[in-house]
Interface confidence: medium
Amino acid sequence: VPIRQLHYRLRDEQQKSLVLSDPYELKALHLNGQNINQQVIFSMSFVQGEPSNDKIPVALGLKGKNLYLSCVMKDGTPTLQLESVDPKQYPKKKMEKRFVFNKIEVKSKVEFESAEFPNWYISTSQAEHKPVFLGNNSGQDIIDFTMESVSS
């Protein structure tokens, strides 16, 4: 069954862009004019979950790659990873829970809360060139992003 997908670039609230630094890691850094096209484009799929006025369940894939952001427990800590999937199976309307994020709109910003691990969010560090990670909104970590629509 066809699944609704939209394409976006994400920047954190410090305007850091997200780039694919090795096959399975996203990093956040400031990009200038000539390397702006390095930032990843996300395919956002609207998937199984519990939508409400302020939360929409989505899955976040990397456009043109068989990679999805997923949340798993590693050494007792919820952890964000890029997971390779079978392109014949994904995306699908009913994704496994580890792929599902609650997209939460706060004013003009957006947050992505793990459906598997409530109150854990896709996060970036204040520092440059650090991996994107799953954080519990503590300290100086950044959980607010802006979304720039990209035509399909």
């Epitope: 069954v1 979950g49 829970k97």
Partner: antibody, heavy 119, light 107 residues
Amino acid sequence: QVQLQQWGAGLLKPSETLSLTCAVYGGSFSDYYWSWIRQPPGKGLEWIGEIDHSGSTNYNPSLKSRVTISVDTSRNQFSLSLSSVTAADTAVYYCARASPSSGWTLDYWGQGTLVTVSS
Amino acid sequence: QSVLTQPPSVSVSPGQTASITCSGDKLGDKFAFWYQQKPGQSPVLVIYLDNKRPSGIPERFSGSNSGNTATLTISGTQALDEADYYCQAWADSFEVFGGGTKLTVLG
């Protein structure tokens, strides 16, 4: 209030084609998936398949070769066709709505139609 | 073909807690749903997305799902809870139901 009302032939001979229709009253038709489920007498539930308003379908692999689900959005109706029936297809057949607000699960059901296959 | 396994029957005394399990390979990776069906009636959704309750379903119904097992728990079970209960999950491209559990409220 959403209501699903279903109808169709209740008695079939082996090798005939089962045809059932479900009409949806109340609520939007295009925002949901529409499903068929069956339950043989005294047994459990078996999911047959689903369709959306555009006509896109998913079927249970075990029934896929014999099943067609279609939709008529102008009438807010969807239908089930099951070919080459045998006694094993005797069951109560239910139509149901799959809603995004409950995680695409079956939140409203029709009243059920008993279909008996007998020579 | 994916399989969800439920005990055929569970018995409980009124006021006690009933637990009905549903097991399947990596079921905790998926969302689980539960339906109640009384004789001669259509099924009714009682738990969705592992642990959410639709409006109108009493608070005594709760759910959990991890590992290979989803569990429907009915606390303070009442006579009117006597029914068949079915778990359900999504298997790649189609829905799968468990075989059903008959809940008997004793006395």
